[in-house]
């Protein structure tokens, strides 16, 4: 004959452990069931009734299936240097990642506790290490031969124009100047960037206004600087 | 654009119920309470109650519990109000507001508010 | 039920003042959970400050908040012509959700 089905709560056999989604409750010394994602235990178990759950209070969550007194608290809301990658739901916490020109400089389980402006090299330096999401940029003086002109996160040192005839010879920060006007390089002009690190949040240019004054998909339609590095600059 | 637009004034008798309603535009039902607070004559504001309309789970000051009934229609995007024995001290305006679950509770929108006098 | 209660029920300032409400809860509120409306005469209140000391896209820079635990408060450092209205600070740590009384700033 089929084993007889449990149903919670029920005392386990003996060196037996708790069905997938129950736990073991000391107190009533039954195996009871567990609460899904988004809900806490209101009542716990007894010998004769099972767990009541109920569903988490505002700005709380829980992501596990779980039998905690109270879901948690939701953290703060991001601030204007970050972007809300995931909301705060009741199964889910927020999560906040810097926006774009920023890097994370104390990241926490999930997403950024602070983050930073990415530096800046300034003319006379280059980028030689890009920044990510949890590095800053590290900037290089211009090596002979090349330059840089702007105060960037993502320009690199370019080389100098080649001169038939120099007028004024180029420097780690300016470009040669050529009498002729001609010059022998073929290289385009224009600055050379490097990319922004990838990210897979949405790249918004400006810092996220706060809170909720911007429609939230909410309600019934049905519808600190990094101190600056040798050749850096801050913002 | 989000809006909160609430039905007319009312005049009321002591003893009789009223309803106020509260249509919502411009966002939808997920995640978000909907929440009732009252201003009398010259008074502050009193939180009266809250509903989630997705679920229809509803909250209230217990000195509201047996007063106010809170519920909502999301297939025409309306939250109500419904306040039972009026009397005279139940002159007030109702305001609805709405708050974005994660927010803490900061109601964000208001609708414009409805007058209800209970007068003899 | 947490009480709130605001300091000082109404004053009276000029414009360009520097004015501080203050806001004092009976047992202790999460800063996330503490926020300030703005309301006028026949108007809907208006979220002026939320979680303590954020302020909502549209709200001049002059209002600010700070404060923690039972004691918190709403500056405005340079009241001007439009800043005259009722204030009101709200907790939501604990139902009932209660507001403070409301604190009237008049043209002195």
């Known amino acids: 004959l089929p084993a007889q089905v449990a149903f919670t709560p029920y005392a386990p056999e003996p060196g037996s452990t708790c069905r997938l989604r129950e736990y073991y409750d000391q107190t009533a010394q039954m195996c009871c069931s567990k609460c899904s994602p988004g809900q806490h235990a209101k009542v716990f178990c007894t010998k004769t009734s099972d767990t009541v759950c109920d569903s988490c209070e505002d700005s709380t969550y829980t992501q596990l299936w779980n039998w905690v007194p109270e879901c948690l608290s939701c953290g703060s809301r991001c601030s204007s240097d970050q972007v809300e990658t995931q909301a705060c739901t009741r199964e889910q916490n927020r999560i906040c990642t810097c926006r774009p020109g920023w890097y994370c400089a104390l990241s926490k389980q999930e997403g950024c506790r602070l983050c930073a402006p990415l530096r800046k090299c300034r003319p006379g330096f280059g980028v030689a290490r890009p920044g990510t999401e949890t590095s800053d940029v590290v900037c290089k003086p211009c090596a002979p031969g090349t330059f840089s002109n702007t105060t960037s996160s993502t320009d690199i040192c370019r080389p100098h124009q080649i001169c038939n005839v120099v007028a004024i010879p180029g420097n780690a920060s300016m470009d040669a100047v050529c009498t002729s006007t001609s010059p022998t390089r073929s290289m385009a002009p224009g600055a050379v960037h490097l990319p922004q690190p990838v990210s897979t949040r949405s790249q918004h240019t400006q810092p996220t206004p706060e809170p909720s004054t911007a429609p939230s998909t909410s309600f019934l339609l049905p519808m600190g600087p990094s101190p600056p590095a040798e050749g850096s600059t801050g913002d | 654009q989000v809006q909160l637009v609430q039905s007319g004034s009312e005049l009321k008798k002591p003893g009789a119920s009223v309803k106020v309603s509260c249509k919502a535009s411009?966002?939808?039902?997920?995640?978000?309470?909907m929440h009732w607070v009252r201003q009398a004559p010259g008074q502050g504001l009193e939180w009266m109650g809250r509903?989630?309309?997705?679920?229809?789970?509803?909250k209230h000051d217990p000195k509201f519990q047996d007063k106010a009934v809170l519920s909502s229609d999301t297939s025409v995007s309306t939250a109500y109000l419904q306040i039972s024995s009026l009397k005279a001290e139940d002159t007030a305006v109702y305001y609805c507001?709405?708050?974005?679950?994660?927010?803490?509770?900061?109601?964000?929108?208001w609708g414009q508010g409805t007058l209800v006098t209970v007068s003899s | 039920d947490i009480q709130m209660t605001q300091s000082p029920s109404s004053l009276s300032a000029s414009v360009g003042d520097r004015v501080t409400i203050t806001c004092t809860a009976s047992?202790?509120?999460?800063?996330?959970?503490l926020h300030w409306y703005q309301q006028k005469p026949g108007k809907a209140p208006k979220l002026l400050i939320y979680s303590t000391s954020n302020l909502p896209s549209g709200v001049p820079s002059r209002f600010s908040g700070s404060g923690s635990g039972t004691d918190y408060s709403l500056t405005i450092s340079s009241l001007q012509p439009e800043d005259f209205a009722t204030y009101y600070c709200h907790q939501y740590h604990r139902s009932p959700w209660t507001f403070g009384q409301g604190t009237k700033v008049e043209i002195k």
């Open positions: 047992s202790s509120v999460s800063s996330n959970y």
């Open positions: 507001a709405r708050s974005p679950y994660g927010d803490f509770g900061a109601m964000d929108y």
């Open positions: 509903i989630d309309p997705a679920t229809g789970n509803t």
């Open positions: 411009g966002f939808n039902n997920k995640d978000i309470y």
